[in-house]
């Protein structure tokens, strides 16, 4: 099954966020991804954990999963590069890049995403916006259309405490409310963007959502940019 | 490794108010509530209540309120618990303890002393 | 306030003995959140308290196998399977669940 949602977000504006992509297993959107560079896409590392046999492709310029538009494109993923310490049992850097066979072909609708490489924190409040296609409700019914939410950054404090994620927040990750509106599992290595710059890539560890004790987590970026660096070198 | 380091013990007079310190080291400072925690000479832990050192934000034990103000100064890394209108039965060892997934850190104790 | 009953207040006990101390709460302490903050802490003479268990069954690091945590709801356990002297103490059960978070009023583990 997909991993990870959107909920209480609304339907966004179609192709307003043309860094967005879609990671798919076999046909089927698996996780969100975020368009980093010409040829690479950044994601979750625990996405592809069960994705051993199958195969794995990135769409890019999509706003509809199933319905043809004119920018959409699926990209054959030439090499995946999860961060070497990513495990399965953790959180801690979740982080996945995904080579495309060819440069994206950038336009209105294609378009990488600056990504925040100074290493400080955002502030506790701010605004972020996170999109994906997730569930969108605990139903579970999967929007075909992407779907955003704003969320206010949570300070570091309060996603460390025992009744929240019980210190388990490292330096590396940062947190944003979770009060009804959410992602989640699904929306997995996509984007959260603070300010028209890419803070966050939303983790892929289960946990419950929409729960205002159990804030999202997201990793930071700027906490990587060696790493990127060096792989997108 | 982190540390918690308290101020020395403090004798005080029956009426008078002491402020006791709790220096943070090995890790960052903000990224935790910082809880305090009573003992009375021979008797049990009473919590007392915590801060989040990125806002000052307070929580109290509706039996400290009045009694326990918690501050924090970010730039030295040091809470702060100020205790007023001292009685003997404010005379205690009093400790400030990290919170993540329970109180693993704690600092060594302060003694107040509440004689005339 | 959850009221944290412990049980026994004293417990004397031999070397290489199995010790269990009781805990009960005045009230559920399943937070809302669906998690169980019950935590277990051993204070020596003139130290700081220290973690041993923490959400009822979970071992704090370098705390040795011989200590378990169970329970649930209202009651909750804490076993040592084989007492050595580095365990004597005042163990204390402790909820973080409810706001005041409280204490018991603490086992002293001892020497017969």
């Known amino acids: 099954p997909p991993r990870g949602r959107i909920l209480g977000g609304r339907e966004a504006e179609a192709h307003a966020r043309p860094y967005m992509a879609s990671v798919q297993l076999n046909g089927a959107h698996l996780c969100g991804g975020v368009l980093v560079a010409e040829q690479w896409v950044l994601s979750a590392a625990h996405c592809l954990e069960d994705a051993a046999d199958g195969k794995v492709q990135v769409l890019l310029g999509a706003h509809s999963l199933s319905q043809p538009e004119p920018s959409k494109r699926l990209y054959d993923v030439l090499r995946a590069v999860p961060h070497p310490d990513s495990q399965p049992d953790t959180i801690d850097h979740d982080l996945l890049l995904l080579q495309l066979s060819e440069k994206a072909t950038l336009g209105p609708a294609v378009r990488p995403l600056p990504w925040q490489r100074v290493d400080r924190d955002v502030a506790p409040g701010t605004l972020c916006d996170v999109a994906g296609w997730g569930i969108v409700n605990h139903a579970g019914r999967r929007p075909d259309s992407l779907q955003h939410v704003l969320l206010p950054v949570l300070d570091r404090a309060t996603c460390n405490r025992r009744t929240h994620h019980d210190g388990a927040i490292t330096e590396r990750l940062m947190c944003a409310e979770s009060n009804r509106r959410d992602s989640c599992k699904g929306d997995s290595g996509g984007p959260l963007v603070c300010g028209g710059v890419l803070e966050g890539v939303v983790t892929s560890g289960s946990r419950v959502c929409g729960n205002r004790k159990k804030p999202g987590i997201y990793t930071r970026v700027a906490s990587y940019a060696a790493w990127i660096d060096s792989v997108l070198a | 490794e982190v540390q918690l380091q308290q101020s020395g013990p403090e004798l005080v007079k029956p009426g008078a108010s002491v402020k006791i310190s709790c220096k943070a080291s090995?890790?960052?400072?903000?990224?935790?509530?910082m809880n305090w925690v009573k003992q009375s000479h021979g008797k049990s832990l009473e919590w007392i209540g915590d801060i989040n050192p990125n806002n000052g934000g307070t929580s109290y034990n509706q039996k400290f309120k009045g009694k326990a103000t918690l501050t924090v100064d970010k730039s030295s890394s040091t809470a702060y618990m100020e205790l007023r209108s001292l009685t003997s039965g404010d005379s205690a060892v009093y400790y400030c303890?990290?919170?993540?997934?329970?109180?693993?850190?704690w600092g060594q104790g302060t003694l107040v002393t509440v004689s005339a | 306030d959850v009221l944290m009953t412990q049980t026994p207040l004293s417990l004397p006990v031999s070397l290489g003995d199995q010790a269990s101390i009781s805990c009960r709460s005045s009230q559920s302490i399943v937070h809302s959140n669906g998690d169980t903050y019950l935590e277990w802490y051993l204070q020596k003479p003139g130290q700081s308290p220290k973690l041993l268990i923490y959400k009822v069954s979970n071992r704090f690091s370098g705390v040795p196998d011989r200590f378990s945590g169970s329970g649930s709801g209202t009651d909750f356990t804490l076993k040592i399977s084989r007492v050595e002297a580095e365990d004597l103490g005042v163990y204390y059960c402790?909820?973080?669940?409810?706001?005041?978070?409280?204490f018991g009023a603490g086992t002293k583990l001892e020497l017969k």
């Open positions: 090995g890790y960052t400072f903000t990224d935790h509530y």
């Open positions: 303890t990290r919170e993540g997934a329970s109180f693993a850190f």
């Open positions: 402790f909820q973080g669940s409810h706001v005041p978070l409280t």
